[in-house]
Every structure is written in structure tokens, then in C-alpha cells.
């Protein structure tokens, strides 16, 4: 139930969070599920525990296996699963799918590419970016705190895009990678006024308690590039990065299509293990660009179970 | 959406036990701690303890250890609190309630109606 | 066990008052959480973490403090917000409330 993949490569640094939240005050004890011997806290071992966190310094490709965490609230002991896999670096410059994370799409005017996990580790500035492994150099490219900006994207700059920067634990430094794909979508054109196109306004939508659903916030900007075009999530007014319900997560990153020649931006939010209370929640997909502001509001509800009776005599 | 029935209003005899329950509905019951808390005139809300449904796990307010049994079923959903060795001191208002978010622990959001015991001779 | 005392046990204000009521905890806790209780109803949450306000619960309340010293203000008191307050920590074992402050309407 409480259990999330992490993956990294070996002789890197590995962060890995609790599945299990709390409150940061929580003291959390980490195990090797299969021993069940206890992962020491010392920053002094190459594996130990701090807090919510579990820390490889650096990872090994014998790392892998299933870590358990407790979480020690006032009242009970609550235990989650971290499911972790080091792999060996590869040889030539290819990186495999397992080791990439969620593809994010750029256009002329909207090109930042965010480094994955990385708010998970002590850095600090400038992140290292590479693409299908050459360093990235020239005035185009800018490293601006956790992403990448590329000035005049052109259809040939989609390609993977590597980010390398050092976390630094007691003075030690340590290499941490991680990859993602960028694809370009390039067109001369014109901006307007945002039209949301997915959720309609004031739509319900049905779901089933305990599944897991996905709302897509999408609306269309103008043709071709676009300066300034976001769409976002907010839950009850709230920006989702206020709202404390780690079930509910909106993607990293926003994906960028083309539509009749129409610029469009959507983003999921995506909602595990839906609740009752979620229905009560007010979802509102926001489009924004340098013309203003659009909402559209929707609410979730219990899909009724269909009486499933057979058409056959 | 999430609702907490509690059972009714009871009349005890001093020194007898009485067994509360709490019907969870609107939510995987096995996913929310259920505690349990009373209202008191003297000392407002006091806490009693606690039963994690899914495991049976329970955590108790030291001060009702030896007076309250937390159960749960988790086939009907429901938990219960027995209550023994009543005496007058134990005629209040007894509420089941869980947090809005488990892990967080952030607040009481969900509240049965109330059970009203009542213990005289 | 942590001790929650509550001040002052009964106040009253008139409407477009500014209300504050404060909780001291007897030793330092992380966070506090807020209870609204009208006569006959359950107690409804109403600030959590010490300056969340719950669902519904209007603008015009404020929770705020750290260690052993809380509150919960009231921008201007309104007729609906005469009720009963309780704090509550989560922060050790066992779980502890105020005695409350009943906050009644001029």
C-alpha cells in the first residue's frame, strides 16, 4: 500500500523519501526488509538513515532490495516500503528507459527543463547539463536554479538532457545524475486570451472510492511559440505544493502539444487511492498568459455502480 | 463523503461495563486510526486512546489503560470501545474521530455524533 | 503529559471586536491544533498545524505561536463564532486538549 520505486546508478549518490509521510519532527527508523537489521544513522556508514530520508553514499548495484521505514507518530508506528534499484553505469552514452524520468515538452518561448529528485539533495548552484552526454555550452543554454532554460529553442535541441550536480554530506562530495527527455514543439504564431479546453466549467466527474484517476488541466494559447503560457492546479484556492495530501501530485513539468495549429499546454493532477474526501474538494484548472487568467472548476463524485445485467435470453 | 455513526445514548448501572461502537463509512476504513475522546465538564476534551484498524494496533491515554478496550471490525467497519468499571465520574459525552490526513496527524476533522453514557443506580 | 492550559476559561466580545485567545503548553510542542464545540453538536476542527484554517472556517481567524505559547484570534468578532475553543498537541503521548475558552457573544 505504502510503497514507492526509486533507482539511481552506482558510485552515485542516492537519496530516497519515506513513502510514508509525517511530520518532520517524526523520528523514522529504516530496515532491510529482508533482515530486517536495522540501517544505522551514523553519516559515518556508506547507507544510513537520516530522518525521512535514506541516504547511499554512493550507492552500490548490491544496494537493491526493499527498504522498510517507520514512521514514529505520538500514537502509532506507521511503516512504508522503498523499492530500490541501483544500476551499473552503461558503458556508451545511451541511457536506458528504466533510468529515465517523465518526458517534458518545450517550445520556443517555454523551455525549461527541471531536474528530477533534486530537492532531495544539499547542492548548490550551477547544475552541470548535458545532452546525449555532450556538456552544454554557449549562451542559449542558462542553468537557473533546479532547471534549464534554452533561449530560441530550436526542433533540434529535443533530445535527453542529463543534469550532474554534487550533494555534499559532511564535506564529502558526491556525483548525482539523472536524465529526461525533451521534445521540441516549434511554431511561428500568434498569443491570446487563454481558451481552456479539458475541464469543461463547473464539470463532474465520477470516480471510484479507492481508485486511482487523473484530471487533465489543458487549454490553448495562440498559435505557434508562446512567451508566457502555464497551466496549473489549485485545490480549494491552494497551490498543490500547499495543500498536504501527498496522494495528490500534479506532474512535474508541463506537456506542450499542438492542436490545429493551436499552442496548448496540459498538465495532470493525478489523485491515488481516492477518498471521500476529495469529493468535497474544488479542483480548479488555471490557464495563464501574458492576456490574463481563465478558471474552470471541477468536482469529483461517486461513480454509481451500474446494475450489469446480460443481454443474452 | 466520510461519516462516523456512533451508537446510542446509554443508561449503566455503577461497576457494570457498556461496549460503544462507531460505524465508518465514505472511506477504506483500514486506511484512518480511529480514536476515541470524551467531553468532560471539569476537564473539556480528553483524549482515551486509539486503534489502527488494519494492523489492531492500539494507543491509550495511560489514564483510561485499565478502563478502556479498543476493538475494530474491519468486515463491518466498525470499531468499538468498551468501557468498564463505570462510576458517575464516567456519565459524559464519548466521541470516535479521525484525522482529516493519517500521517500528517493534522487535527481531529471527522467526528461521530456522540455517545452519551450514562451510569446510575 | 503535556499540559494545555487555556486562557482566559470564559470571554465575551461584540461584534467587530478583535478576539484573541491564547493556549500555553506545559512543555514546548511543534504545533497546535484548534477545536470550534457549540452546545450540543461534536467539536469541529478549525485551525490545524497553528495557522491552517479548515475547510469553511472564515478568513477573519488566525492561529499563530511555537514552543509552549499559542493563539487563535478573531479579526472581528461575529454572532456565529460565540462558542467553545479547544487546543489540542499532537506532538507527544499522550495526545492533550485545553480546558477551553468559551467565547460568548456581547
Known amino acids: 500500500k505504502f510503497s514507492k520505486q526509486s533507482w539511481g546508478l552506482e558510485n552515485e549518490a542516492l537519496i530516497v523519501r519515506c513513502p510514508r509521510q509525517g511530520k518532520s519532527s517524526y523520528i523514522v527508523d529504516w530496515y532491510y526488509s529482508q533482515t530486517n537489521k536495522s540501517i544505522p544513522t551514523q553519516e559515518r556508514n556508506r547507507v544510513f538513515a537520516s530522518g525521512q530520508l535514506l541516504k547511499f553514499l554512493p550507492a552500490e548495484v548490491a544496494d537493491s532490495g526493499i527498504y522498510t521505514c517507520i514512521v514514529r507518530s505520538p500514537t502509532f508506528n506507521r511503516t512504508g516500503y522503498a523499492n530500490v534499484t541501483i544500476y551499473k553505469k552503461q558503458p556508451d552514452c545511451n541511457v536506458p528507459d528504466y533510468l529515465m524520468y517523465s518526458t517534458v515538452s518545450g517550445s520556443e518561448k517555454n523551455s525549461k527543463i527541471y531536474c528530477p529528485t533534486i530537492d532531495l539533495y544539499n547542492w548548490t548552484a550551477p547544475l552541470e547539463w548535458f545532452k546525449n552526454c555532450q556538456a552544454l555550452q554557449g549562451s542559449r543554454y542558462k542553468a537557473h536554479k533546479s532547471f534549464l532554460v534554452i533561449d530560441n529553442v530550436m526542433t533540434d535541441d529535443a533530445g535527453d538532457y542529463t543534469c550532474k550536480f554534487i550533494h555534499n554530506e559532511n564535506g564529502a562530495n558526491y556525483s548525482v545524475t539523472a536524465t529526461r527527455s525533451f521534445t521540441v514543439k516549434d511554431e511561428q504564431g500568434f498569443s491570446r486570451f487563454p481558451v481552456i479546453r479539458a475541464p469543461a466549467h463547473n464539470e463532474t466527474k465520477e470516480v471510484e472510492i479507492g481508485e486511482n484517476t487523473n484530471l487533465t488541466c489543458s487549454a490553448c494559447f495562440g498559435k505557434g511559440a508562446q512567451f508566457l503560457a502555464t497551466v496549473q492546479w489549485q485545490l480549494n484556492g491552494n497551490k498543490i505544493t500547499d495543500f498536504s495530501e501527498p496522494r495528490i501530485q500534479q506532474e512535474e513539468g508541463q506537456n506542450q502539444s499542438f492542436s490545429n495549429g493551436l499552442a496548448c499546454v496540459n498538465t495532470v493532477l493525478r489523485i491515488a487511492d481516492v477518498k471521500e474526501e476529495d469529493l468535497l474538494l474544488r479542483y480548479d484548472c488555471l490557464a495563464l498568459n501574458l492576456h490574463g487568467l481563465r478558471r474552470h472548476t471541477i468536482r469529483l463524485s461517486r461513480k454509481n455502480p451500474i446494475d450489469h445485467q446480460s443481454t443474452y435470453c | 463523503q466520510v461519516q462516523l455513526q456512533q451508537s446510542g445514548a446509554e443508561l449503566v448501572r455503577p461497576g457494570a461495563s457498556v461496549t460503544l461502537s462507531c460505524k465508518a463509512s465514505g472511506y477504506t476504513f483500514t486506511d484512518s486510526e480511529m480514536y476515541w475522546v470524551r467531553l468532560t465538564p471539569v476537564h473539556g476534551l480528553e483524549w482515551i486512546g486509539a486503534?489502527?484498524?488494519?494492523?489492531?494496533?492500539?494507543a491509550f491515554n495511560q489514564k483510561f489503560k485499565g478502563k478502556a478496550t479498543l476493538t475494530a471490525d474491519k468486515s463491518s467497519s466498525t470499531a468499538y470501545m468498551e468501557l468498564r468499571s463505570l462510576t458517575s465520574e464516567d456519565s459524559v459525552v464519548y466521541y470516535c474521530t479521525r484525522a482529516f490526513d493519517n500521517d500528517n496527524d493534522d487535527g481531529f476533522a471527522y467526528w461521530g455524533q456522540g455517545t452519551l453514557v450514562t451510569v446510575s443506580a | 503529559q503535556i499540559v494545555m492550559t487555556q486562557s482566559p476559561a470564559i470571554m465575551s466580545a461584540s461584534p467587530g471586536e478583535k478576539v484573541t485567545m491564547t493556549c500555553s503548553a506545559s512543555s514546548s510542542v511543534n504545533y497546535m491544533h484548534w477545536y470550534q464545540q457549540k452546545s450540543g453538536t461534536s467539536p469541529k476542527r478549525w485551525i490545524y498545524d497553528t495557522s491552517k484554517l479548515a475547510s469553511g472556517v472564515p478568513a477573519r481567524f488566525s492561529g499563530s505561536g511555537s514552543g509552549t505559547s499559542y493563539s487563535l484570534t478573531i479579526s472581528s468578532m461575529e454572532a456565529e463564532d460565540a462558542a467553545t475553543y479547544y487546543c489540542q498537541q499532537w506532538s507527544s503521548n499522550p495526545l492533550t486538549f485545553g480546558a477551553g475558552t468559551k467565547l460568548e457573544l456581547k
Open positions: 486503534i489502527d484498524p488494519e494492523t489492531g494496533d492500539t
